[in-house]
Amino acid sequence: MEPRAVADALETGEEDAVTEALRSFNREHSQSFTFDDAQQEDRKRLAKLLVSVLEQGLSPKHRVTWLQTIRILSRDRSCLDSFASRQSLHALACYADIAISEEPIPQPPDMDVLLESLKCLCNLVLSSPTAQMLAAEARLVVRLAERVGLYRKRSYPHEVQFFDLRLLFLLTALRTDVRQQLFQELHGVRLLTDALELTLGVAPKENPLVILPAQETERAMEILKVLFNITYDSVKREVDEEDAALYRYLGTLLRHCVMADAAGDRTEEFHGHTVNLLGNLPLKCLDVLLALELHEGSLEFMGVNMDVINALLAFLEKRLHQTHRLKECVAPVLSVLTECARMHRPARKFLKAQVLPPLRDVRTRPEVGDLLRNKLVRLMTHLDTDVKRVAAEFLFVLCSESVPRFIKYTGYGNAAGLLAARGLMAGGRPEGQYSEDEDTDTEEYREAKASINPVTGRVEEKPPNPMEGMTEEQKEHEAMKLVNMFDKLSR
């Protein structure tokens, strides 16, 4: 049904005809996410009519239908102004049961109405800066946080939980004040860590979480994203022991996330959000990643369980295949692995064994090839400064921040950027908590060491002799040309 016909029906005001018109419009446009310009004015008119009814109060019988139409039109940027008013937002917040009001809602809310209103709010907050501001002013985050805290006590449908969390994500992503409010005043890290634990469910110790079901995966990812937003600005500072305990507790849950698969091909996405959040934890709290007890089938190295580090490394390998948005893809996991390697010797030795195994092939440039080392060395000359820095930093830490060793594995040309940035061009080693980690040279490396070009990091083929096959006269002619060039230079 055309928006004009629906608007006309609304203006005549016969209830059944209106409802039928709205239902027909909803059916036709349930999957419309873009709208043609031809009917823009009709849609705007329809939006204005819907808003006037919304602000007066929708009839209980047909609320869901009206809200569905509002949801569809809230995807249309040209209709945003109509919906993004204080009264409209308040009405939607009331139907979503997240308005801060003096009088409590008398009867339990209708979940279908609640869900539709949440979806409308998500669309509006996503696309309208005015709606973002009004939602922040209306302190919707307070009631949303309150409801997230009720998930343990009361049963809410998956979709309601998901859109609660999605709205929290949008508000915290788009509004600094909401981020701070949720972080400080509403104890968001505690609240959402608890929600994450509830969502991950329980697995007996003998049978750790293996595959997270689809709905739980969706909710867990929204929680991880909200936690990322609220910890992004706040956590790099020093934390006291009780806060550190909370972040370590969160870290243990994230450890399970890294080790778990997600249903429906969403494992990499799930791990991506997990790794992003790990990167926000206070550095001293990352020790929980290596605190896993050894058990049958776990990967042991120097007496430590390396399952998590190995899973992060596998994740990095997967991410290195991607060509677009490389910074978002690899920087977080490289940062986490770098910090683990920096503070934990067994982790560093394990990662070095995997990433920088003893050099054998000394004839290929370090950046050429498909090994993890080659890919990371290639990143060291990437156009994006951050990508370049994290890749170099990771390899440098694996070399125990030893300049000669770093050059040995990456070549001086590739290493120069990081060394210059750190003022280490002359060699030496910066301050760091590294014991004298030995670096074992292979037979092949020892034999070729004298012939390796330190700039390229490989044995160069001897260039052909340019004088080969020249007559004595030709040689003399070339020599004279050279003398003339030097003569010009010295003038």
Partner: nanobody, 114 residues
């Protein structure tokens, strides 16, 4: 209604051991993280250690290596095994849900004195 009941406290000499227990009701215990806290006379209540629903544990530095938290989901109970006790461990010990605290019980008194 959430209820948490701590027991097992008592008087013990320095270097001795005690095992505290906490029985929980009114919560879906197995999906909850749990923690032990303590409050010494004239001091703020402080966190001692936590256990996740997966059984992972975290402890405050001063009790690491001496205290062990475990849980029994079948009995809705969490316990705190305290070894090599010191006089500074004297306090009233409480258990609670974690990371969001729900309800504080009466606690159980632990006194370490020669």
């Amino acid at each position: 209604q959430v209820q948490l009941v701590e027991s097992g406290g008592g008087l013990v000499q320095p270097g001795g051991s005690l095992r505290l227990s906490c029985a929980a009701s009114g919560i879906i215990f197995r999906s909850n993280g749990m923690a032990w806290y303590r409050q010494a006379p004239g001091k703020e209540r402080e966190w001692v250690g936590s256990i996740t629903s997966f059984g992972d544990t975290i402890y405050r530095d001063s009790v690491k290596g001496r205290f062990t938290i475990s849980r029994d989901n079948a009995r809705n109970a969490v316990s705190l095994q305290m070894n090599s006790l010191k006089t500074e461990d004297t306090a009233v010990y409480y258990c609670n849900t974690y990371p969001v605290n729900s309800y504080w019980g009466q606690g159980t008194q632990v006194t370490v004195s020669s």
